[in-house]
């Protein structure tokens, strides 16, 4: 009997009954590799409370239709007095990724699962060339799910200091270049999930092979390897590979972009801080409200619910969409469909489709985005059940008493997209969010200007236009409300710019939209300040101009006009300079833009070396100087000694050339003992120095060896910029 869903065959999948603390392992084509469940178990249940295992589905006793898979067992069970056998039932629905099996419920006899997956679609439009499972459960059975990050077309550009290359990645699946309008990706080979673009050429540097792994609490890892035998000529004989580490942030924040943290011999290490790496209870709710302590979020959309037969109406050219949230649309056409989103053809109102049902609802908050998803609508020709995705945006001045109205933005493969500006989507305050700008490969980061809490103080703008008696004080913070301290104590709580004079304080604008690159400068617009007459609100523009080396200068008031409705400040600061890579000498490196100077020479050992021990090896390492330890070679900056026989390898010749990019200081030792491979590649060492104000000198931590480079991480206070 042929496997019904071959795309799902290569993996053992997991699902969890959180209420009863039960973990299920599912292999739909073969058997799970768990001795306690027997040799032919396709669905193995692990009860963590009782520490017992039971097979609840046998691979031999499988029956399948296009949308249902049943695994029976020979174990009897009692259900309402009838003699049944224990079985598992998996209902398949068409989805846009491989998806995840979800536990639905269990009776004495039947364990029910539901699985939305590309494997169940009638047509192949969503199917990938290569895709791997994109979720994982942690030791507390909490789900970390990166499926929402998977791009169905296009890719993510990895932030890197190299202007000559661009690394594009997708998450858990290959990059679909055919459906992507971007010309840069057109040349990427099929199957690649990591595509390196150099000039007009594109190279496959990694394809998905294994599923997502949890390496430790709130850190997930995805590894891509290049499958083809042919080597790339710029990789020095090495096979390319990509490791993406997804990190759950410790506080609420807008998603960052993936960032390249190490690159040598075509081994790319990427770190991506994203709330999708956090466990899913933080991010999702089946109701209309959501709160998460870790993200400092509290959202309630129930005030948007319409009752008494009315609905929101959104115009979609050929169709009208009737929507409700937190309840079904009570429109006559849509009766009995239990639809939250109802699609009606303008030219023929008898053609009515449910574009998502209200009891199939997921409210999701992640990386600063609030999304309401209604799925389980009427089927399309592909077999995919229609679904609707409503992206909410915070707008405290939305019409309709702050409720606002949904706007249809488009349809892709039977998924309908809406945006909805409403005050009910406002999440406390957008602190630490999007405090930078991008312009192609150039990145700008204003976070050095943010003042978070006392003892820090607000920036005070210079205003030379007034006499002392009528003096106004202008307090400014960047990407953050002003701190209510000193003369700004009476400022409105959510003001990002505040004016204080003898009559009191005024809100000149809130941080609502992120900075933008404009005409060579960075523009930051604060809006929705206090009323200034004629139904208008005060707005402030801050133009930030690059001034290398200066993080001290204050902003200057340039103009105020429109009857006190508009203020303009100019700020010459290093924070407005493009992030660039800098090389240094003599164990120092100078970040010319920010004006930071780093000197790691206090870490250099004049005699001896730092010793790091692992089970099999001792590593001796020095900073900007040679290790003077027998049996290490006298000019090596790092060396490896086998504990068993004292065999020694030079891991690179010492030098004092530090490099710096976006807060990361690195030291590279090259030209060590060659490997016994055909290219005789010399061993190398990469040390990444990171700021830890508590650490003093600190110490090296061995990370891993990736082919020919030994990676160390070193937290030290000497890598911290002096606070301005």
């Amino acid at each position: 009997q042929a496997a019904p869903f071959p795309e799902l065959c290569s993996y053992t999948w997991e699902a969890v009954d959180t209420k009863n603390n039960v973990l299920y392992k599912i292999n739909i084509c073969g058997s799970v590799d768990i001795v306690q469940c027997g040799p032919s178990s396709a669905v193995c249940m692990h009860d963590l409370k009782t520490r017992t295992y039971h097979s609840v589905g046998d691979s031999v006793l499988r029956s399948a239709t296009r949308s249902l898979l049943e695994f029976n067992t020979t174990v009897s069970c009692d259900q309402q007095g009838t003699n049944h056998r224990v079985q598992s039932s998996i209902a398949f629905l068409c989805g846009k990724t491989l998806g995840t099996p979800e536990f639905v419920t269990a009776t004495e006899c039947v364990h029910y699962f539901e699985w939305r997956t590309t494997a169940a679609c009638k047509k192949d439009i969503f199917k990938a060339n290569k895709e791997v499972p994109c979720y994982v459960f942690d030791e507390e059975l909490r789900k970390h799910d990166l499926n929402p990050l998977i791009k169905l077309s296009g890719a993510y550009l990895v932030d890197d200091s190299d202007p000559d290359t661009s690394l594009f990645i997708n998450v858990c699946r290959d990059i679909d270049t055919l459906r992507d309008p971007g010309s840069q990706l057109r040349a990427c080979p099929p199957g690649t999930a990591a595509c390196l673009v150099r000039g007009h050429q594109a190279f496959d540097v990694g394809q998905p092979r294994d599923g997502l792994k949890l390496v430790r609490k709130d850190r997930l890892v995805l590894s891509y390897v290049r499958e083809e035998a042919g080597k790339l000529d710029f990789c020095d004989g090495h096979s390319p590979a990509v490791t993406i580490t997804f990190v759950c942030p410790s506080e609420r924040r807008e998603g960052t972009i993936p960032k390249l943290t190490a690159k040598s011999n075509c081994r790319y290490e990427i770190e991506w801080i994203t709330e999708y790496a956090c466990h899913r209870d933080y991010l999702e709710s089946k109701t209309c409200s959501l709160s998460g302590e870790q993200q400092d979020v509290s959202i309630d959309l129930t005030p948007l619910a319409q009752s008494g037969g009315s609905s929101y109406i959104s115009d979609g050219k050929e169709y009208l969409f009737y929507l409700n949230v937190c309840g079904e649309t009570e429109i006559q056409f849509c009766n009995k469909k239990q639809a939250a989103v109802c699609q009606v053809k303008k030219s023929d109102t008898s053609q009515v489709k449910a574009a998502g049902r209200y009891h199939n609802q997921t409210l999701r908050y992640s990386d600063g985005d609030l999304t309401l998803i209604y799925f389980g609508g009427d089927e399309c020709s592909s077999g995919f059940q229609r679904m609707s995705v409503i992206n909410f945006e915070c707008n405290k001045t939305a019409g309709n008493d702050g409720k606002g109205t949904p706007v249809f933005t488009g349809e892709v493969d039977c998924t309908y997209f809406f945006t909805w500006d409403t005050e009910y989507a406002c999440v406390k305050e957008k602190e630490d969010l999007l405090c930078g700008a991008t312009d192609g490969k150039k990145r700008y980061d204003l976070s050095a200007l943010v003042r978070h809490a006392e003892p820090e103080q607000n920036w005070e703008a210079v205003d030379g236009s007034q006499t002392e008696t009528e003096k106004k004080h202008f307090f400014i913070n960047i990407c953050h409300r002003v701190l209510q301290e000193g003369k700004a104590r009476g400022c409105p709580e959510d003001a990002a710019v505040c004016a204080v004079d003898k009559n009191g304080s005024k809100n000149l604008g809130k941080f609502i939209s992120s900075p933008m690159k404009e005409k060579g400068n960075i523009q930051l617009s604060y809006s929705d300040g206090d009323d200034c007459g004629h139904g208008k609100k005060i707005k402030t523009n801050i133009t930030l101009v690059c001034k290398p080396g200066d993080l001290e200068s204050a902003p200057v008031l340039r103009t105020s006009g429109e009857g006190g409705c508009f203020y303009e400040f100019e700020w010459h600061t290093a924070a407005a300079c493009v992030l660039s890579k800098t090389e240094g000498e003599n164990c120092t490196v100078f970040d010319s833009q920010a004006g930071f100077s780093f000197d790691l020479s206090p870490l250099t050992k004049k005699n001896g070396a730092y010793k790091v021990e692992t089970k099999k090896y001792d590593f001796y390492i020095n900073v900007c100087g040679p290790v003077s330890v027998s049996p290490c070679q006298p000019d090596s900056g790092a060396c490896q000694v086998a504990k068993s026989d004292e065999k020694t390898w030079n891991l690179g010749l010492s030098n004092a050339k530090l490099s710096y990019y976006d807060g990361m200081i690195q030291l590279n030792y090259r030209g060590g003992t060659p490997y016994n491979n055909e290219r005789h590649t010399p061993r190398a060492t990469l040390i990444t120095f990171l700021c830890d104000r508590d650490a003093g000198v600190g110490f090296p931590e061995y990370q891993e060896e990736d082919n020919s480079t030994y990676n160390f991480r070193w937290y030290t206070s000497y890598a911290c910029p002096e606070e301005p």
């Epitope: 430790r216 759950c248 830890d692 937290y715």
Partner: nanobody, 114 residues
Framework: EVQLVESGGGLVQAGGSLRLSCAAS????????VGWYRQVPGKERDVVAS???????YYGDSVRGRFTISRDNAKNTMYLQMNSLKPEDTAIYYC?????????WGQGTQVTVS
């Protein structure tokens, strides 16, 4: 809330041994770089020994060969076995964990070698 609690300090004669323990709550020891630091009055805290999530270890020059760091992931506890103690090992010993959120310190336990 993250809490680190040290125990096992005390008075011991030169040449003797002590075993310090650090019990953690609110954090998984096995998933983070953790270590022991010590401080004598008027000086900065110095690293004594450290162990990463990948089990690589680091020892300060003055204790290498005499002290051993270990951890029991099941008990979420870290240990420092101190042998051949010397009077210059007298200090307050602190347990520390570094996570992606920042670093956490215990309150410290006094070790006095006479």
């Amino acid at each position: 809330e993250v809490q680190l609690v040290e125990s096992g300090g005390g008075l011991v004669q030169a040449g003797g041994s002590l075993r310090l323990s650090c019990a953690a709550s609110g954090i998984i020891f096995g998933a983070n770089t953790v270590g022991w630091y010590r401080q004598v009055p008027g000086k900065e805290r110095d690293v004594v020994a450290s162990i990463t999530s990948g089990d690589s270890t680091y020892y300060g020059d003055s204790v290498r060969g005499r002290f051993t760091i270990s951890r029991d992931n099941a008990k979420n506890t870290m240990y420092l076995q101190m042998n051949s103690l010397k009077p210059e090992d007298t200090a307050i010993y602190y347990c520390r964990a570094r996570t992606t959120d920042g670093s956490y310190w215990g309150q410290g336990t006094q070790v006095t070698v006479s």
